[in-house]
């Protein structure tokens, strides 16, 4: 469930602190409820960037688990189509710390509406 996704995000945050990854990531910091699935997709795609750049087994495994969890939760809700949402590339680029904070916020949005 989404609580496990948050604990994975916390774990990624802890793992990243011991590294120096300077990447900036497309970040949706003001998610509209009607675009939350699209925003989630962008967050997950950018997480893969973190995984790739870190080259770290623990980060890789945690990112993969997080994506598996999110996929399964969202697929159980059926196909959700959203329109008029921003493309990932249109989002503001932010550092990893801000990116992860915004990610936690969107997950909390899913928790509050489930």
């Amino acid at each position: 469930n989404w609580v496990n996704v948050i604990s994975d995000l916390k774990k990624i945050e802890d793992l990243i602190q011991s590294m120096h990854i300077d990447a900036t990531l497309y970040t949706e910091s003001d998610v509209h409820p009607s675009c939350k699935v699209t925003a989630m997709k962008c967050f997950l795609l950018e997480l893969q960037v973190i995984s790739h750049e870190s080259g770290d087994t623990d980060i890789h495994d945690t990112v993969e688990n997080l994506i598996i969890l999110a996929n399964n939760i969202l697929s159980s809700n059926g196909n959700i189509t959203e329109s008029g949402c921003k493309e990932c590339e249109e989002l503001e680029e932010k550092n990893i710390k801000e990116f992860l904070q915004s990610f936690v916020h969107i997950v909390q949005m899913f928790i509050n509406t489930s």
């Epitope: 893969q48 087994t57 598996i68 996929n71 969202l74």
Partner: antibody, heavy 122, light 112 residues
């Protein structure tokens, strides 16, 4: 050439336990997730379990969840499947398979062992 | 759970002729990141399964180019352009977009 060699199969009574092993060689074991897949006699393939590269994350179908445990020892290049509370329907050839994960180009079980037969019968 | 349904279950083919196997999923297997994790495996008689195709249409190394994969969403196809004797066996589609990962029932290809 990538090699995966399963062992530990055999005859076991219903309710009994068995531990399968899969010895990996000719690749960096810790760089890959691993899976177990089984095949009942004359039947199709069934996914049984997957474990992440570091071993922290495991995944199972409901048919084995709570009874089977996948684990690994990266220092020994070995994958395990602990099978408890075995049932007649668990009778199958058990294959271990190397799993390519998405960050490295998509999911797939790209190399398989020869399998080990588990027979659950009284 | 995602149910994978293959057809036909038995496929008699003349050597040198094309063959086609269909695989349908009970729901879309496009994951949230836009990837479709659909593979095809071949199991020759008495042998272990072997990876042919991954991510719908990518041929695994060493797989002859007479094998091709296509499809999207819920409908997928494995095609063999000209069947050879060594192609005899059972072919399985498999989805690992969503846990639990699931195989199709298998299609047995035999020579007429």
């Amino acid at each position: 050439e990538v090699q995966l060699v399963e062992s530990g199969g055999g005859l076991v009574q219903p309710g009994g336990s068995l531990r399968l092993s899969c010895a990996a060689s000719e690749f960096t074991f810790s760089n890959y997730a691993m899976s177990w897949v089984r095949q009942a006699p004359g039947k199709g393939l069934e996914w049984v379990a997957t474990i992440s590269r570091g071993g922290d994350y495991t995944y199972y179908p409901d048919s084995v969840k709570g009874r089977f445990t996948i684990s690994r020892d990266n220092s020994k290049n070995t994958l395990y499947l602990q099978m408890n509370s075995l049932r007649a329907e668990d009778t199958a050839v058990y294959y271990c398979a190397r799993r390519v994960s998405m960050i490295t180009g998509g999911y797939a079980m790209d190399y398989w062992g020869q399998g080990t037969l588990v027979t659950v019968s009284s | 759970d995602v149910v994978m349904t293959q057809s036909p279950l038995s496929l008699p083919v003349t050597l040198g002729q094309p063959a086609s196997i269909s695989c349908r999923s009970s729901q879309s297997i496009v994951d949230i990141t836009g990837n479709t994790y659909l593979e095809w495996y071949q199991q020759r008689p008495g042998q272990s399964p072997r990876l042919l195709i991954y991510k719908v249409f990518n041929r695994f190394s060493g797989v002859p180019d007479r094998f091709s994969g296509s499809g999207s969403g819920t409908d997928f196809t494995l095609k063999i352009s000209r069947v050879e004797a060594e192609d005899v066996g059972v072919y399985y589609c498999f989805q690992d977009s969503f846990v639990p990962y699931t195989f199709g029932q298998g299609t047995k290809l035999e020579i007429k």
